[in-house]
Amino acid sequence: QAGPLPKPTLWAEPGSVISWGNSVTIWCQGTLEAREYRLDKEESPAPWDRQNPLEPKNKARFSIPSMTEDYAGRYRCYYRSPVGWSQPSDPLELVMTGAYSKPTLSALPSPLVTSGKSVTLLCQSRSPMDTFLLIKERAAHPLLHLRSEHGAQQHQAEFPMSPVTSVHGGTYRCFSSHGFSHYLLSHPSDPLELIVSGSLEDPRPSPTRSVSTAAGPEDQPLMPTGSVPHSGLRRHWE
């Protein structure tokens, strides 16, 4: 053997963010020489599952018929060929939504904003949470975290945007979470359509899409500006 076996590729269908109760399939793709595929979950002491390869032997399927809290977490896969085990795949983070009640997303002062002005998206939860995530549909980098300092729990998080440009227009949702598991999120908030007027082109309304939908390469990342709000929350980029 000249060197370590190449690492397999690990992914989830229909995506890695799954609502409670929905099904998800984890795929591990290795090589045509694979004899067995193994899936490991972080902090699980035994191999999480193992499967024979599907013909033509270059991948294996790990099925989760109904998503629950127990399945949320960080996974890696391996394959075994006649010369031994491969390197681990890059990790797959499987996130479950629906663990907590949905927060409310609103725009201050209004979801209709003139280009160049400021707007703040406010995500509010009924019970105190320590992490809030803002998601813009069809964004290349959809997750923006605001996480509380020192585990202090908050009922809301502010996401200021200034100055607003046409790039900020679109459909947003937010989630809330507890820090003890980054992989368990609330139900999504109802969508909020942010409409930016006064730009050279009219904003295109975004169709409602599931958070597990892959972003297109042409979409722009969400880029809010301004200082971190005075709420004890710290901004984290994903």
Epitope: R35, E36, K41, S44, P45, A46, P47, W48, D49, R50, Q51, N52, D70, R80, P82, V83, G84, W85
Partner: antibody, heavy 124, light 107 residues
Framework: EVQLEQSGAEVVKPGASVKLSCKAS????????MHWVKQRPGQGLEWIGE????????NYNEKFKSKATLTVDKSSGTAYMQLSSLTSEDSAVYYC?????????????????WGQGTSVTVSS | DIVLTQSPSSLSASLGDRVTISCRAS??????LNWYQQNPNGTVKLLIY???RLHSGVPSRFSGSGSGTDYSLTISNLEQEDIATYFC?????????FGGGTKLEIK
């Protein structure tokens, strides 16, 4: 010391079901998968299936998919196998056996400890 | 499924003898071959895993060798406590399969 203590012999009627138990001790129960193996009188060994005590994931031999159901109780460190719609072909000794990694950093997995076996006799 | 053919199905040997049991797989199993001992009372123990690695607590008179499809278990100096049935088992692909067994008796 690793021990797998299996439940006592069973005599059951055709068409009935039976649930066998396997209580593990001497190691961390969730760190090893549990396998079940069948041995008919005077014959070889047949692999029935395996279960991961951490998450209840199972893999079955196709031959036993509609015959055996594997479960675990993590709190008591016990694995179970239920056999349904029993016929004379199911009369056998059934073994539980733990499966895991051998060696500290080696990628070798094998069944390393076995229970004493449970005899099941199907008779009217 | 992979078929393992063990030979002989039974053999008689004298104490102190060197005994060899063979196991042939229906396809290459890449050394994922284990050997088990089943005593007359039904107790099953792992002897050797991955063709030649001795499991902890197993006497050094037991050894294993082979590659590809052909494997063997050797007992170099037969003792009374070795009277048992020996099974090979492949762990290369699911489902794991066993050989038919070799019953070892004293001459």
């Amino acid at each position: 010391e690793v021990q797998l203590e299996q439940s006592g012999a069973e005599v059951v009627k055709p068409g009935a079901s039976v649930k066998l138990s396997c209580k593990a001790s001497g190691y961390t129960f969730i760190s090893y998968w549990m396998h079940w193996v069948k041995q008919r009188p005077g014959q070889g060994l047949e692999w029935i299936g395996e279960i991961n005590p951490t998450n209840g994931r199972t893999n079955y031999n196709e031959k036993f998919k509609s015959k055996a159901t594997l479960t675990v109780d993590k709190s008591s460190g016990t694995a179970y196998m239920q056999l349904s719609s029993l016929t004379s072909e199911d009369s056998a000794v059934y073994y539980c056996a733990r499966w895991g990694q051998l060696g500290l950093r080696e990628g070798y997995y094998a069944v390393d400890y076995w229970g004493q076996g449970t005899s099941v006799t199907v008779s009217s | 499924d992979i078929v393992l053919t063990q030979s002989p199905s039974s053999l008689s040997a004298s104490l102190g003898d060197r005994v060899t049991i063979s196991c042939r797989a229906s396809q290459d199993i890449s050394n994922y071959l284990n050997w088990y001992q089943q005593n007359p009372n039904g107790t099953v123990k792992l002897l050797i895993y991955y063709t030649s690695r001795l499991h902890s607590g197993v006497p050094s008179r037991f050894s294993g060798s082979g590659s590809g499809t052909d494997y063997s278990l050797t007992i170099s100096n037969l003792e009374q406590e070795d009277i048992a049935t020996y099974f090979c088992q492949q762990g290369d692909t699911l489902p794991p399969t066993f050989g038919g067994g070799t019953k070892l008796e004293i001459k």
